[in-house]
Interface confidence: low
């Protein structure tokens, strides 16, 4: 339904607090380098304007679109050209091109300083002094570093962030209370950001049809008792929500997400028996809970799929009549019967089924042609099953750190042109699949592992897209969304790669490594490992293990020495020489 003033409509729907928070997130995701104070000023100006429109929807400029209003406001930033360069050219464009231009300049890896966590007392004082500014700063810092973070979900994170400080700043041991909560929020936040980045990549790079197919499969697994019409409605609404958020339309997105949660809870009897607890929660918790809800039990009496999709004489007729609907129904029926499959596997099966029908429905005897289509699924199902089995065995044998190292070596050999920080980040995350998924029983391993790997490989794809250096990465990232993981798995050592020149500086370490956290020390060692492989891509596992063991011993020895810096200088030279000899450099 059309509103005279879109900004007044959203302000009234969302309320002032959420309105201001969402506008701040939107601005910080677009202008990632702008100082906090500048953003707060812009948000306050927009909010005051929105209030005038609430009072009188016919007031001047109140009929303008949100893109026009927000874009005009962003384009008032005085330092736009010197801070953002060519992004300033967006301001010469008209809507909708101007917003598209801003979207294209979102940076997945902005050049921003690492967020350093202050002392707990310092944080608690800041929280008590000015709670509102403290929480706004959190939204700003997360949003500018994660320009595709799902905005309504970030409001949920901010609510938990506030709750943690409210509780822990009064606790006897503030640090013991607060730090684990902040660690949990940080880890969950990174995971949430990466999951949403895949949704946006799916919509932006592969289109609405790809996203809808993903949603049909996932929702059918989650709500196997819901009928196809219900799943269709949820998919349509969910697609609208994510299209809006990925497009920077955060107010509309948050409003529509709230409407969707309301609809789901009003109709839970026909959707899922698992929603009761979620639907008793307040809005932000409710939406989060629904998004994470466990799969409902499968209906007991589901008939064989073959009857409708292979044996029926009407298969080609039904397919021709409405191709996407028929394929959607196939995906729905297959997914609700297979919570044990990953979404990407289900999508590969649906693609195989589609390809078979395209070929067979044009053949002389269509039924004869597609009669064995389900046999083609067997190798597609077995490939991820075998891969997960092998990798979980390796993980159980090595533990997380060494499993990450094995993946670091594997991926550096596959795509050695990729930057070392990206290889370290991506391989560390790939390695986390072990502790995340291998503990699950067989029936839950594949959806856990392969869908998680899709999220991590998408990180590689978006980082690589910013500065493309490898044709192999580009190929795996762009050819097929659902075949990215099999594409990367199939890559062998890149024989065309010319090894990097040896640089002793890369392997020079200092006493500061001793004061690092265990995680940061691991990253230092893993960075060295990637560099070793880039210098000597044909090094064997045994050679690399020997060098890494020597390196670990060297760090341990020098961190215990009285004169640490001298130890690192002298023992470091010996280590480099020994490593060069061991690797034949």
């Amino acid at each position: 339904d059309a509103h005279k003033s879109e900004v007044a409509h959203r302000f009234k729907d969302l309320g002032e607090e959420n309105f201001k928070a969402l506008v701040l997130i939107a601005f910080a995701q677009y202008l990632q380098q702008c100082p906090f104070e500048d953003h707060v000023k812009l948000v306050n100006e927009v909010t005051e304007f929105a209030k005038t429109c609430v009072a009188d929807e016919s007031a001047e400029n109140c009929d303008k679109s949100l893109h026009t209003l927000f874009g005009d406001k962003l384009c008032t930033v005085a330092t736009l050209r010197e801070t953002y360069g060519e992004m300033a050219d967006c301001c010469a464009k008209q809507e909708p091109e101007r917003n598209e231009c801003f979207l294209q300049h979102k940076d997945d890896n902005p050049n921003l300083p690492r967020l350093v966590r202050p002392e707990v007392d310092v944080m608690c004082t800041a929280f008590h002094d000015n709670e509102e500014t403290f929480l706004k700063k959190y939204l700003y810092e997360i949003a500018r570093r994660h320009p595709y973070f799902y905005a309504p979900e970030l409001l949920f994170f901010a609510k938990r962030y506030k709750a943690a400080f409210t509780e822990c700043c009064q606790a006897a041991d503030k640090a013991a209370c607060l730090l684990p909560k902040l660690d949990e929020l940080r880890d969950e936040g990174k995971a949430s950001s990466a999951k949403q980045r895949l949704k946006c990549a799916s919509l932006q790079k592969f289109g609405e049809r790809a996203f809808k197919a993903w949603a049909v499969a996932r929702l059918s697994q989650r709500f196997p008792k819901a009928e196809f019409a219900e799943v269709s409605k949820l998919v349509t609404d969910l697609t609208k929500v994510h299209t809006e958020c990925c497009h920077g339309d955060l107010l509309e997105c948050a409003d529509d997400r709230a409407d969707l949660a309301k609809y789901i809870c009003e109709n839970q009897d026909s959707i899922s028996s698992k929603l009761k607890e979620c639907c008793e929660k307040p809005l932000l918790e409710k939406s989060h809970c629904i998004a994470e809800v466990e799969n409902d039990e499968m209906p007991a009496d589901l008939p064989s799929l073959a009857a409708d999709f292979v044996e029926s004489k009407d298969v080609c007729k039904n397919y021709a009549e409405a191709k996407d609907v028929f394929l959607g129904m196939f995906l729905y029926e297959y997914a609700r019967r297979h919570p044990d499959y990953s979404v990407v596997l289900l999508l590969r099966l649906a693609k195989t089924y589609e390809t078979t029908l395209e070929k067979c429905c044009a053949a002389a005897d269509p039924h004869e042609c597609y009669a064995k289509v389900f046999d083609e699924f067997k190798p597609l199902v077995e490939e991820p099953q075998n891969l997960i089995k092998q990798n979980c065995e390796l993980f159980e044998q090595l533990g997380e750190y060494k499993f990450q190292n094995a993946l670091l070596v594997r991926y550096t050999k596959k795509v050695p042109q990729v930057s070392t920080p990206t290889l370290v980040e991506v391989s560390r995350n790939l390695g986390k699949v072990g502790s995340k998924c291998c503990k699950h029983p067989e029936a839950k391993r594949m959806p856990c592992a392969e869908d998680y790997l899709s999220v991590v490989l998408n990180q590689l794809c978006v980082l690589h897209e910013k500065t493309p250096v490898s044709d192999r990465v580009t190929k795996c990232c762009t050819e097929s969304l659902v075949n990215r993981r099999p594409c990367f798995s199939a890559l062998e050592v890149d024989e065309t790669y010319v090894p990097k020149e040896f640089n002793a500086e890369t392997f020079t370490f200092h006493a500061d490594i001793c004061t690092l956290s265990e995680k940061e020390r691991q990253i230092k060692k893993q960075t060295a490992l990637v560099e070793l492989v880039k210098h000597k891509p044909k090094a064997t596992k045994e050679q690399l293990k020997a060098v890494m063991d020597d390196f670990a011993a060297f760090v341990e020895k020098c961190c215990k020495a009285d004169d640490k810096e001298t130890c690192f200088a002298e023992e470091g030279k010996k280590l480099v020489a020994a490593s060069q000899a061991a690797l034949g450099l």
Partner: nanobody, 124 residues
């Protein structure tokens, strides 16, 4: 192509009842959302009622809630509209419609196939 044929219309007194039927052929009936719409002389077509594939969901316009009941029999490829406590303002041409992939049961543009209509006149 799905063909829809409505029947059961006629003249009835205020407070009376009618049962409309819509027989479908040419498609897999159980995969369609089915709806009833109506158009009074000189007015726009308006939503009356809809029913999802397995009869789990039914939707009604506020003006007919509590008086009209939509149902379907997938084994007979037929959808019904039971109309009770009829009023003069219910006078209209009633259309049956089928939708393959819908999210808004009440929007006529979501429906792919339409019948020719059956006339209902409520008059004393």
């Amino acid at each position: 192509e799905v063909q829809l044929v409505e029947s059961g219309g006629g003249v009835v007194q205020p407070g009376g009842s009618l049962r409309l039927s819509c027989a479908a052929s040419g498609g897999t009936f159980s995969t369609y959302v089915m709806g009833w719409f109506r158009q009074a002389p000189g007015k726009e077509r308006e939503f009356v009622a809809a029913i999802s594939q397995n009869s789990i969901h039914t939707y009604y316009a506020n003006s007919v809630k509590g008086r009209f009941t939509i149902s379907r029999d997938n084994s007979k490829n037929t959808v019904y509209l039971q109309m009770n406590s009829l009023r003069p303002e219910d006078t209209a041409l009633y259309y049956c419609a089928a939708s393959r992939f819908t999210s808004w049961y009440t929007a006529d543009y979501e429906y792919d196939y339409w019948g020719q209509g059956t006339l209902v006149t409520v008059s004393s």
